[in-house]
């Protein structure tokens, strides 16, 4: 069943069918001898009751106030009272843009990212008995789509995809064609799950060490899951047997990110190892980021300023 | 609109320099690196270098490395690629595109070297 | 530097028939950590750039058809086109971007037969 129109304030189109629906349906059905009112109330006009002789365009079905179709004069506040049961609504009928689909304050925002999934269905559970055929536009442009009783597109969104969608549902009552438009205007962002990697530490770093001796580098990035880290040395890596890459750690951070750590481990430090540039770059699709050690003999560490020292 | 515009045609003598621009717009700049390839007349694709548009670091095929210098402009959303002394054989048509894998691609800038 | 060799360089298809290119690396593009291939697949077509059709060796780029896949893992990958249509023909290359430099294959060039 189609539910309540529980929102107090309420902007519609003129031209449209459109319906109220009070939210004591099911106590109403209880409960049928009871005295059920609808009221209006507009400006210098106090509670009116509304029946179906008020106007040819409204129609009462129990829980219902049904216009067919909506019109800028029925603009104001509506009153369902049952019993001590009283329920509100503030009802503005704006105008129909005639040089559109669609109208522009009436228009659904939403924010689809890049790749993801993105659905639109066309559907209008109150009308859909009512309903002949439904057709979707974009950007007032009719697709063409097989369903033509529900249109739907559902795919991995593209930067194209961006635009306004409008399902026009058409229906006849009582002999008159009437549709009803609903409009979303679609933003496709980029996926900002994304994060620019970051190495941490400094980016240049002096390791003082002994000749004969093992170090090991430590190379730690915040990074995306599909990001790469590795290191770079010598001509060709893999070229000197004392030096090892060891395996990747990676742990998940509480917000979804990864924290990556990379050892590369130079044993039997020789001569040749000393003041070489041993790199370690991270890569994402946002480019490449390095950090650089180089191995100095402790010997030599008075000739460097303390502060770039990793021990 | 998602889009890399490349600047026009160039013809340079050898030993020249030339600048090739590609503006990128509807999309976030510095959050895709920019790689160029070139593609010499009837020949397959050559991966020039990247520049990471948010933080500048590059990265240079090695046979470029001293005659290619790569840079962005982040207020304009442009980057450029240089190329110094110019031979015959840079005779090309060089592409600018987005990421690592290049779902976004250029239309493409001819240079032609010729004495 | 990795090296990526496509076989073969030229391939004719009939219409509707499946055409498969393959593609080699000098040195594995599988990413442990995350066991992703760092591959892509590309269409070029006289007068344009290159289009992507597959990343990740085997994800296909949105708006590209069905009738194209990518499959393989490490160091040997095969790009599928399960029934050619005459719009296919076209050099198409693939490309590392495990390592800097980013390389590509040669390209294979496919023709209707």
């Known amino acids: 069943a189609e539910s309540c129109t529980s929102r107090p304030h309420i902007t519609v189109v003129e031209g449209e069918p459109f319906y109220l629906k009070h939210c004591s349906c099911s106590l109403a059905h209880e409960i049928e001898t009871t005295t059920k009112s609808w009221y209006k109330s507009s400006g210098s006009q106090e509670h009116v009751e509304l029946n179906p002789r008020s106007s040819s365009r409204i129609a009462l079905h129990d829980c219902v106030l049904e216009f067919w179709p909506v019109e800028l004069n029925d603009t104001g506040s509506y009153f369902f009272q049952m019993k001590n049961y009283t329920q509100k609504w503030k009802l503005n009928v704006i105008r129909r843009n005639k040089h559109s689909c669609f109208t522009e304050r009436q228009v659904t925002s939403k924010i689809v990212e890049v790749k993801k999934f993105f659905q639109i269905t066309c559907e209008n559970s109150y009308y859909q008995t009512l309903v002949n055929s439904t057709s979707l536009y974009k950007n007032c442009k009719k697709l063409l789509l097989e369903n033509n009783k529900n249109p739907t597109i559902k795919k991995n969104a593209e930067f194209e995809d961006q635009g306004y969608y409008s399902c026009v549902h058409f229906l006849h009552h009582n002999g008159k064609l009437f549709n009803i438009t609903k409009t979303f205007n679609i933003t496709i962002v980029e996926d900002r799950s994304n994060i620019v990697p970051v190495l941490l530490g400094p980016k240049l770093n002096h390791v003082a060490v002994e000749l004969g001796k093992n170090v090991r580098l430590n190379c730690s990035a915040l990074l995306n899951e599909e990001d790469v880290i590795y290191w770079m040395f010598g001509e060709e890596n893999g070229s000197d047997p004392n030096i090892h890459e060891e395996k990747e750690m990676r742990i998940m951070t509480p917000e979804g990110k990864w924290h990556a750590s990379k050892v590369l481990r130079i044993e039997n430090i020789g001569e040749s190892n000393l003041n070489v540039l041993y790199n370690c770059t991270v890569a994402s699709t946002g480019g490449t980021d390095t950090k650089s050690f180089i191995l100095v003999r402790k010997a030599d560490m008075a000739d460097i300023p303390g502060h770039v020292f990793t021990r | 609109q998602v889009q890399l515009v490349q600047s026009g045609a160039e013809v340079k003598k050898p030993g020249a320099s030339v600048k090739v621009s590609c503006k990128a717009s509807?999309?976030?700049?510095?959050?895709?690196?920019i790689s160029w390839v070139r593609q010499a007349p009837g020949q397959g694709l050559e991966w020039m270098g990247w520049?990471?548009?948010?933080?500048?670091?590059?990265n240079y095929a090695q046979k470029l490395q001293g005659r290619v210098t790569m840079t962005t402009d982040t207020s304009t959303s442009t980057a450029y690629m240089e190329l110094r002394s110019l031979r015959s054989d840079d005779t090309a048509v060089y592409y600018c595109?987005?990421?690592?894998?290049?779902?976004?691609w250029g239309r493409g800038t001819l240079v032609t070297v010729s004495s | 530097d990795i090296v990526m060799t496509q076989s073969p360089d030229s391939l004719a298809v009939s219409l509707g028939e499946r055409a498969t290119i393959n593609c080699k690396s000098s040195?594995?593009?599988?990413?442990?950590?995350?066991?992703?291939?760092?591959l892509a697949w590309y269409q070029q077509k006289p007068g344009q750039p290159p289009k992507l059709l597959i990343y990740?060796?085997?994800t296909r780029e949105s708006g590209v058809p069905d009738r194209f896949s990518g499959s393989g893992s490490g160091t040997d990958f095969t790009l599928t086109i399960s029934s050619l249509q005459a719009e296919d023909v076209a050099v198409y290359y693939c490309?590392?971007?495990?390592?800097?430099?980013?390389?590509f294959g040669q390209g294979t060039k496919l023709e209707i037969k």
């Open positions: 595109a987005r990421g690592w894998y290049f779902a976004l």
């Open positions: 509807g999309y976030t700049f510095t959050s895709y690196g």
């Open positions: 520049i990471s548009a948010y933080n500048g670091n590059t």
């Open positions: 040195q594995s593009v599988l990413y442990s950590s995350n066991n992703r291939n760092y």
């Open positions: 990740w060796a085997s």
């Open positions: 490309q590392q971007f495990y390592r800097t430099p980013y390389t």
